[in-house]
Amino acid sequence: SPVPPSTALKELIEELVNITQNQKAPLCNGSMVWSINLTAGVYCAALESLINVSGCSAIEKTQRMLNGFCPHKVSAGQFSSLRVRDTKIEVAQFVKDLLVHLKKLFREGQFN
């Protein structure tokens, strides 16, 4: 049976928590990604940013999970207007910011 949206979001949060807690060396070798606007369309925007990081096993599960939340096909090099213009941050900081935002969505009951 399909996973309820609340469970899917909780699983994504859990994965991001695991990444932040288990981080020893710089996440994804310190790769930089485009910062995104967290106020709308967060799942697709996050995927559009993270999909450009390749060869980083630590975030592969996150990429797959975000893909399940995003209704359209996302490919590397694709960017929507949700990108914060010309601002790049480390993947580790991106994950932390995303986690804070998703936890707030969960607490508010915004699962979709």
Partner: antibody, heavy 123, light 107 residues
């Protein structure tokens, strides 16, 4: 040391509004990941979760009682308030407040509880 | 809502015994299961959170286990101070729901 203490009217009449106060110490509701819940237990029955308020004022209610419940907080005075409108004899219970911390995973585990305050609804 | 069922409303055991209290959820709660102890004076304490994590200050004779829908609380070497009612609570989905409680008594 974390402590919570509930206070209320003790007795009130049907159709009135129940106002409860939870006064706490040992933590701050301005701290990220902190929350306070209200739970009640009617005599001889199980525990029932009523409402929750997070540090950033996100509020959640039990859907069965949502239309009658209002939760709020005064961070500076370390208090959380619960109002239950249009009370009936079925609302007679011991009312507890408790702290929730959500560091990392969202646990919804209430790690410290008040002693409870007894509320009787009677005409 | 998720229903939480504690089949035993009361249990009788002797001091020094090993006691297991069970709790069943009406659906998978993914280990978001907490155990509370309510003493006869009304004091409520968290014992175990997230199925098996011991809350600070709780004696190590308390332990929790389970997964999916079935969970249990075990008390080893039962002591007089353990006489209380024990409640399970699911923290996976709102509204939060509790089991009906299991009252532990001394034989």
């Amino acid at each position: 040391q974390v402590t919570l203490k509930e206070s209320g009217p003790g007795i009130l009449q049907p159709s009135q509004t129940l106002s409860l106060t939870c006064s706490f110490s040992g933590f701050s509701l301005s701290t990220s990941d902190m929350g306070v819940d209200w739970i009640r237990q009617p005599s001889g029955k199980g525990l029932e979760w009523l409402a929750h308020i997070w540090w950033d004022d996100v509020k959640r209610y039990n859907p069965a009682l949502k239309s009658r419940l209002t939760i709020s907080k005064d961070t500076s005075s370390s208090q959380v308030f619960l109002m239950l409108a249009s009370v009936d004899t079925a609302d007679t219970a011991t009312y507890y407040c408790a702290r929730t911390v959500s560091s990392g995973y969202i646990y919804y585990a209430m790690d410290y509880w008040g002693q409870g305050t007894s509320v009787t609804v009677s005409s | 809502d998720i229903q939480m069922t504690q089949t035993a409303s009361s249990l009788s055991a002797s001091l020094g015994d090993r006691v297991t209290i069970s709790c069943r959820a009406s659906q998978d709660i993914r280990n978001y299961l907490n155990w509370y102890q309510r003493k006869p004076d009304g004091t409520v304490k968290l014992l175990i959170f997230y199925t098996s994590k011991l809350h600070s200050g709780v004696p190590s004779r308390f332990s929790g286990s389970g997964s999916g829908t079935d969970y249990s609380l075990t008390i080893r070497n039962l002591e007089q101070e353990d006489i209380a009612t024990y409640f399970c609570q699911q923290g996976n989905t709102l509204p939060l729901t509790f089991g009906g409680g299991t009252k532990l008594e001394i034989k």
